[in-house]
């Protein structure tokens, strides 16, 4: 004959205020005959939570039909949970006695604690943009969770980061806790399309972590590289000069041409293209009149990117006698 065991599978049950808590208790044997009661706490001061025979327990219902003689499930549900309900709950088998029933065997107990889900993590990046090869800091915050135990991870494009520091406050007992973590991320030139993810795992989330994201496009500045080239002449007395501004981000860019130090208003044409890595290329063409020009024309392409100091590239125009004499129907 199997010895009776009282099984309470959960050591800890996290519940939310206002919700219904299910406290599980099963027995391994129908014998000996006798009632199963629920208590909160132990000893003489323990509180009766449910007795199928006596008392009024409006918030308590049984999960199974206790009238079935082969019933081995004595689990109960407690509705409308309040902070006053926290404590350790025991299902206890009794043998009928006179004048009082006799405690026969108790379950190991289930601690009911108030659980609160963490808020969605909010990830904030640096206030100002930084160039590649530099380190930037991202912060992640989540609030209002309980119990205190929580796991936070950082990822960059799916790869876990290790350079971060995390604090959970307060350190002592509290109804709810907050987490703040700061991760240090080294920027790569291709990070325009990269993302950092802050992932928070908590017992109340049932294995479905919360995530907060930030785009590195908000934190990175990729400075342009400039190249000024002279094109073969296309039309009579004009030379086409190209300024290629490559691999910059963000798009904010001002380009000006100078001829021998004098800013020119005219710009023949320009195109903006986006690269696969999210950076941009800008090409500007400038037509220089070379009829009656001296040989010492210096063209400057100046670029002011994202409010930074201007960078420029010069080109000393090479105009050969042959070019000056070329007819208007010359081909490149």
């Amino acid at each position: 004959e199997e010895e009776l065991q009282m099984i309470q599978p959960e050591k800890l049950l996290l519940v939310t205020v206002g919700k219904t808590a299910t406290l599980h208790c099963t027995v391994t044997s129908l014998l000996p005959v006798g009632p199963v009661l629920w208590f909160r706490g132990v000893g003489p001061g323990r509180e009766l939570i449910y007795n199928q025979k006596e008392g009024h327990f409006p918030r308590v219902t049984t999960v199974s039909d206790l009238t079935k003689r082969n019933n081995m499930d004595f689990s109960i549900r407690i509705s409308s949970i309040t902070p006053a309900d926290v404590g350790t709950y025991y299902c206890v088998k009794f043998r009928k006695g006179s004048p009082e029933n006799v405690e026969f065997k108790s379950g190991p107990g289930t601690e009911m604690a108030l659980g609160a889900k963490p808020s969605a993590p909010v990830v904030l990046g640096p206030a100002a943009r930084t160039t590649p090869e530099h380190t930037v800091s991202f912060t992640c915050e989540s609030h209002g969770f309980s119990p205190r135990d929580i796991t936070l991870k950082w990822f960059k494009n799916g790869n876990e980061l290790s350079d971060f520091q995390t604090n959970v406050d307060p350190t002592g007992q509290s109804v709810a806790y907050s987490i703040r973590s700061t991760a240090r991320v080294v920027l790569d030139p291709w990070d325009v399309r990269s993302q950092v993810i802050c992932e928070v795992a908590h017992v109340t989330l049932q294995g479905d972590p919360l995530r907060g994201t930030a785009n590195l496009s908000e934190a990175i500045r990729v400075p342009p590289t400039l190249e000024v080239t002279q094109q073969p002449m296309r039309v009579g007395n004009q030379v086409n000069v190209t300024c290629q501004v490559r691999k910059f981000y963000p798009q904010s860019l001002q380009l000006t041409w100078s001829e021998n130090g004098n800013v020119c208003q005219r710009e023949t044409a320009s195109t903006l293209t986006e690269n696969k890595d999210g950076t941009y290329n800008w090409t500007s063409w400038f037509l220089v009149n070379i009829s009656d020009q001296r040989d010492d024309v210096v063209l400057t392409c100046q670029v002011k990117h994202d409010g930074q100091l201007a960078v420029s590239k010069r080109l000393a125009l090479e105009v050969t006698v042959h070019q000056k004499d070329q007819s208007s129907d010359a081909t490149p």
């Epitope: 004959e1 014998l31 000996p32 005959v33 009632p35 009238t67 003689r69 043998r95 006695g97 026969f104």
Partner: antibody, heavy 119, light 107 residues
């Protein structure tokens, strides 16, 4: 299968005592309690008392208090009911009945023992 | 003590009839009530426990209902073997008490 077998009929004189036995088989006595119920000729059922199969604890009907004793012998799986100072109104069929669940109904009954009290 | 009042004390019915027996407790006993059937010269037999739970092996024409103080035993279609005396019993608290019984006779 579960069975409760009671001792045979008894004829007793007023003032005497009677001890009725109830032997349980097909289950462990320790796991179930026993009620004793009697029925006078042509009358209804009357609860006499209860004995715990667990520890021998008892509870008796007020009107029989001091005259009734219920005991058990786990080694022989037998429960006993002794009634002393017999009177003619104690003439009845005496039943032992097993308490079947925590709802405390009597799911198995002995065949009954007729006790006749007559001078 | 909790008094159990059973009614009627006797009734005559025919095979196939629907029969209803009531039992009233002097105070609330929730669902702590059992019904028994007894035939002459035999020990009682459990029919219903916990007010409405049918004992294993008992035909489904027997049913119990009620809670608190008022309870009913119903035989949906009386069979020849159902002519007997029926007792209710409160199992809520000591002293356990029985109703006076209802004798179901052939009309």
């Amino acid at each position: 299968q579960v069975q409760l077998v009671q001792s045979g009929a008894e004829v007793k004189k007023p003032g005497a005592s009677v001890k009725v036995s109830c032997k349980a088989s097909g289950y462990t006595l320790n796991n179930y309690d026993i009620n004793w119920v009697r029925q006078a000729p042509g009358q209804g059922l009357e609860w006499m008392g209860w004995i715990s199969g667990y520890n021998g604890n008892t509870n008796y009907a007020q009107k029989l208090q001091g005259r009734v004793t219920m005991t058990r012998d786990t080694s022989t799986s037998t429960v006993y009911m002794e009634l002393s100072s017999l009177r003619s109104e104690d003439t009845a069929v005496y039943y032992c009945a097993r308490v079947g669940s925590s709802w405390e109904e009597n799911d198995q009954w002995g065949q009954g023992t007729l006790v006749t009290v007559s001078s | 003590d909790i008094q159990m009042t059973q009614s009627p004390s006797s009734l005559s019915a025919s095979v196939g009839d629907r029969v209803t027996i009531t039992c009233r407790a002097s105070q609330s006993i929730s669902r702590w009530l059992a019904w028994y059937q007894q035939k002459p010269g035999k020990a009682p037999k459990l029919l219903i426990y916990a007010a409405s739970s049918l004992e294993s092996g008992v035909p489904s024409r027997f049913s119990g209902s009620g809670s608190g103080t008022d309870f009913t035993l119903t035989i949906s279609s009386l069979q020849p073997e159902d002519f007997a005396t029926y007792y209710c019993q409160q199992t809520h608290s000591f002293p356990l008490t029985f109703g006076g019984g209802t004798k179901v006779e052939i009309k």
